[in-house]
């Protein structure tokens, strides 16, 4: 029960963020205009990866995408690059932990058949997780330097378009959803792998042996035990069918009774 | 089509206040930001400020912050300034506009004189 | 604040013939966001309340003729008219649409020689 609950959350916590992810790389603010100097501004300016924007007092918003590949900077790119490769990963790494989650029944799927697919999803959202929290840090990085730079009556280039010294940028609201959900999915990830452990099957059992000690007829059936797991003693009743050992709980498993997102 | 209309005339005494309305019609009230322009006999253009009448949000030129206050009410599309403690350097005319595109305004009321006289 | 200068405070141009009007800001009016200008003419005549001319420097609003042009960029701005007509006659406001407080040029009264 603990192994499906892991296995549930973690497939929860890692859609939620893989969504946050996808919705990071959309959103327009990457970079907002710093208003420390000027904080109540007639036309405010802001970028996103794809697209920078400039909204007026008057409530008229436009957008402007940047439709060129190489006028933009090497980290900009570098930054979508990271962001698409942590959203493909973390979309194969959902429908991989779909049919993987122990609560669905397909077919005659093996247990370790559905351990190997969790640990595959797991190790996916890890790294899409890693790839969003650096792709954002990437980000903040470059905005850290160009400020400065900016601030030094410089003049920086972002997104193809050249900022003067008057228009600074500080951190967007993208930027801490990417690191939210990048974190989120890291831990999606940890918690599916810490569940495929729980899902594999005991895979050396020794063969049930009869003792027959000198005036008992008992026989002791030893209950088959995992290889070098280091998770503690086995102390589940145990069924053994041809010397194979399974918990109770692993001969028939019944969907459970979760609600998914 | 977009209208702005404002009340009649008013003619006050030094010290008082005086609250101006302008009526929005033809078109979502809560859509455009409301700017007012005070305008002497003779002279030139003066922004007072701007309101946001879906949030209320407002902004000041720092010449009128403290005396006038800007408010509108969205179930009547109306949106009015007070001026307190008049001068006789505020008679005037006193126009509302609608903040479009650009941060241009596009859309002006008539006016409405204001006399300070005691 | 922002302040607008503008030259000359009055013209006088026969008509049919072209009439340039200047403006100055003490600060740039360009953002960088978008490489637009904001900068509003405007249009005043007697008894009237203004009437938008054009924004974002030399956008042209709809229904203003084709002859009333603007151009100029950063803080040096100009209004033309090509060949003014009679009802040209009016006075002309910049003003600084980029910054709190908003800010009008003293106004260029514009007759026929």
């Known amino acids: 029960m603990a192994v499906t609950a892991c296995q549930g959350l973690g497939f929860v916590v890692s859609l939620i963020g893989i969504a946050g992810i996808i919705a990071a790389t959309c959103m327009d603010q990457w970079s907002t205009q710093d208003l420390y100097n000027n904080p109540v501004t007639a036309v405010f300016n802001y970028q996103g990866l794809w697209r920078s924007c400039v909204r007026e007092s008057s409530g008229f918003t436009e957008c402007r995408g940047y439709f060129t590949l190489l006028g933009l900077p090497a980290m900009l790119q570098a930054v979508r690059a990271l962001m698409i490769v942590g959203i493909v990963l973390g979309a194969i790494g959902l429908l991989v932990s779909i049919f993987a989650l122990k609560c669905i029944r397909i077919g005659s799927m093996e247990d370790s058949a559905k351990a190997n697919m969790t640990l595959t999803s797991g190790i996916m959202f890890i790294v899409s997780g890693l790839c969003a929290i650096a792709g954002v840090s990437v980000f903040a990085n470059m905005l850290v330097t160009n400020f400065w730079m900016s601030t030094a009556n410089m003049y920086t280039g972002m997104g193809g378009m050249v900022q003067t010294v008057q228009t600074r940028y500080t951190f967007g609201a993208a930027l801490f959803v990417g690191w939210v959900a990048g974190g989120l999915t890291l831990i999606g990830g940890v918690m599916m792998c810490i569940a495929c452990r729980g899902l594999a099957p005991e895979e050396t059992n020794y063969k049930a042996v009869s003792y027959h000690a000198s005036g008992h007829s008992v026989a002791y059936k030893p209950g088959g035990f995992k290889a070098s797991t280091g998770f503690g003693s086995n102390t589940k009743n145990k069924k053994i069918y041809d010397g194979g050992a399974r918990t109770e709980d692993e001969v028939q498993s019944y969907p459970s009774k979760h609600d998914y997102v | 089509q977009v209208q702005l209309v404002q009340s009649g005339a008013e003619v006050k005494k030094p010290g008082a206040s005086v609250k101006l309305s302008c009526k929005a019609s033809?078109?979502?009230?809560?859509?455009?930001?409301i700017n007012w322009v005070k305008q002497k006999t003779g002279q030139g253009l003066e922004w007072i400020g701007e309101i946001h009448p879906r949030g209320g949000n407002t902004y000041y030129s720092e010449k009128f912050r403290g005396r006038a206050t800007l408010t509108a009410d969205k179930s009547i599309s109306t949106a009015y300034m007070e001026l307190s403690s008049l001068r006789s350097e505020d008679t005037a005319v006193y126009f509302c506009?609608?903040?479009?595109?650009?941060?241009?305004?596009?859309?002006w009321d008539q006016g409405t004189t204001v006399t300070v006289s005691s | 604040d922002i302040v607008m200068t503008q030259s000359p405070s009055s013209l006088a141009v026969s008509l049919g013939e072209m009439a340039t009007i200047n403006c100055k800001s003490s600060q740039s009016l360009l953002n960088s966001g978008n490489q637009r200008n904001y900068l509003t003419w405007y249009q005043q005549k007697p008894g009237q309340p203004p009437k938008l001319l054009i924004y974002?420097?030399?956008t042209r609003e709809s229904g203003v003729p084709d002859r009333f042009s603007g151009s100029g960029s950063g803080t040096d701005f100009t209004l033309t008219i090509s060949s003014l007509q009679a009802e040209d006659v009016a006075v002309y406001y910049c003003?600084?649409?980029?910054?709190?407080?908003?800010?009008f040029g003293q106004g260029t009264k514009l007759e026929r020689k």
């Open positions: 506009a609608i903040l479009r595109r650009g941060n241009a305004m596009d859309y």
């Open positions: 974002w420097a030399s």
């Open positions: 033809g078109y979502t009230f809560t859509s455009y930001v």
């Open positions: 003003q600084n649409s980029y910054n709190y407080p908003y800010t």
